[in-house]
Amino acid sequence: EPCVEVVPNITYQCMELNFYKIPDNLPFSTKNLDLSFNPLRHLGSYSFFSFPELQVLDLSRCEIQTIEDGAYQSLSHLSTLILTGNPIQSLALGAFSGLSSLQKLVAVETNLASLENFPIGHLKTLKELNVAHNLIQSFKLPEYFSNLTNLEHLDLSSNKIQSIYCTDLRVLHQMPLLNLSLDLSLNPMNFIQPGAFKEIRLHKLTLRNNFDSLNVMKTCIQGLAGLEVHRLVLGEFRNEGNLEKFDKSALEGLCNLTIEEFRLAYLDYYLDDIIDLFNCLTNVSSFSLVSVTIERVKDFSYNFGWQHLELVNCKFGQFPTLKLKSLKRLTFTSNKGGNAFSEVDLPSLEFLDLSRNGLSFKGCCSQSDFGTTSLKYLDLSFNGVITMSSNFLGLEQLEHLDFQHSNLKQMSEFSVFLSLRNLIYLDISHTHTRVAFNGIFNGLSSLEVLKMAGNSFQENFLPDIFTELRNLTFLDLSQCQLEQLSPTAFNSLSSLQVLNMSHNNFFSLDTFPYKCLNSLQVLDYSLNHIMTSKKQELQHFPSSLAFLNLTQNDFACTCEHQSFLQWIKDQRQLLVEVERMECATPSDKQGMPVLSLNITCQMNK
Amino acid sequence: QKQYWVCNSSDASISYTYCDKMQYPISINVNPCIELKRSKGLLHIFYIPRRDLKQLYFNLYITVNTMNLPKRKEVICRGSDDDYSFCRALKGETVNTTISFSFKGIKFSKGKYKCVVEAISGSPEEMLFCLEFVILHQPNSN
């Protein structure tokens, strides 16, 4: 069975084809090759000599037991080598020779028992080494690591490392890898020698499900003293053994680390005293809790020095009390409990993501809701009912505003966005908005992107609501049940490049409303009910137009519409997916491609 | 279509079939077997995925006695610092995991429950596997 040609001459997918040897019928130009799940078993010297351009090679689960010297010799362009799930028993010293451009080596679940005799010391270009799910017992980083000066990611998770000693990291003292991210999760750790991490600098350290008791956790974290780490991730996994007890003493040792960003990821334990628990983390710049349950929500009003707070997938009794002077970014997403938003006091806040919480807002939105006048980014998407009761007074700095899939109330009662002259991006898609007021978008003089799909208009008619949006480049009006539009609806949109009118209820096409759209490149009218043209004579669309989508409409392929069908043929160079432009009537022509019709009408007269 | 039996409990019988062409082997055990009136137990899965499990989600299509419920999407792996350790599993890596579950206080009517589980993962998204579970529910007289 042949390999699947994914990208001709470049990418080949040969997965699970029962190959016992490497295929030699693929082009020399192959750059990406997936040979996974084939019983190759043995890689001899120069096994891939016929793939001189290869960049990515996937050998996952190929039952490989032996890799000989120079197996990959000649692959000087190879950047990624994946060996996951091979029961390697014999790895020659020169197994990886010739891989002068290798950046990523994945040797997960390969029976690797030690880093010491893993022959990769010459791979100077290596950026990522993943040796997770192996049998490694010692965390001693061999001397050859001093050659791996580009290493950025080392994944040692799910191994058998129990202890870390001062000597294990000696090589890092000799050549500080300023950018190294280290994952030690799921190693059964019980001892870290104090001083082992002294004056070590890491970009990221991840320790999840490493400790089987609170005491072990406490002493191991104390053993991290002296570490300078940009991002520290602690926590557990839901499907692994969890700590029976967790209290403030667990994290006391963090006072002896220098941490820029901290994250606690999943804890099967109720956190009741955040102030004491995170006492050593008051001055990290970014603080993040993922999948934890928080009892006392008032604690977030303590004077933490965080600039970025992230609360994701957590459980709260009620919406937390947030009073944080220095906070610039707040991400509060996919949380449960506390369904009603309550005011926060965050005077420095510039970025606020409150999406996917099922929150309801009694009144939105003004400076008093968020306690800031600096807000530039606000995401309230995928929430509950949001009642618009103020038009963003004090929030004039906003540049990005997203309400999609929330239920907006009182949108047509006043000019909701009047203050937002700096707004560039607005998404009110699927917000149950019924446009009944022409001044709905007044004030949005800088707006470039407007997404309002899945809403509705009074009498299914699009009025002149865009008159002030002179900078608009993208407009989505799909799924709005529109049947008609004002001939001057788009007259002021001279910068508009993309207009999506798909999935509406238009029965005829008219070029007149688009005459002023001098920058229009894409016009999508798919999934309407277009049968014919509105006027007998259709003019041309703007000369800038490059893509016109008229697919899945109800074209009437009869003589009375001959001029319209001819006009469509004349637009052939603009049309996309022409094979999906089919006749709907008459019944004898149903399903026929519109462009293949020979429109001579004498026969039917 | 071969049917794979999972387990029987006092009020339910659970089995599954594959609803995809690939039919890559997957081993599923539930201990103790699910009782629909209330249940607490462990789900054990042994599986070798054909793609990375990063950004894994399930599309669930549930049918109750021939009545179709709306499609439901359950995100399991968001993509970074996920709740489950198997979210970091790579294509070809053995996934051998036990997940605890519990639910109570749901009253189910007697009959045949079908649940098609489409597992989607990776970037670009592709189907990982598709299983159709059948639960025959015989409520006790109480």
Epitope: I22, D24, L43, Y46, S47, F48, F49, S50, S74 | -
Partner: nanobody, 112 residues
């Protein structure tokens, strides 16, 4: 036991030609992808010519139009015709059987 014996190397002036031969014993080459690989001191090794069983060939840009690989399955031999040689073509040239290995190599030195 499979053996590959290269010959034909030597010292030449820039612009001259050489023809390398590789005689294989212990295995039939008719079903094997064959090629030549060169290693210059202090430089990254590179494939200079590959020939498949159907006769299709590959050359990197650095030798394209100057080098030509051919095979004689009856004689179990592979050849590399090198024309318009340049100083940067200097190195040890190894005959390769994909998946099996290489010979001892033959030295090619091109002087200016």
């Amino acid at each position: 036991e499979v053996q590959l014996v290269e010959s034909g190397g030597g010292l030449v002036q820039a612009g001259e030609s050489l023809r390398l031969s590789c005689v294989v014993s212990g295995i039939s080459i008719s079903t094997k992808v064959m090629g030549w690989y060169r290693q210059a001191p202090g430089k990254q090794g590179e494939s200079v010519a590959i020939i498949k069983t159907d006769g299709s060939t590959y050359y990197p840009d650095s030798v394209k139009g100057r080098f030509a690989i051919s095979r004689d399955n009856a004689k179990n031999t592979v050849y590399l015709q090198m024309n318009s040689l340049k100083v940067e073509d200097t190195g040890v040239y190894y005959c390769i059987i994909t998946g099996w290995g290489r010979g001892q190599g033959t030295q090619v030195t091109v002087s200016s």
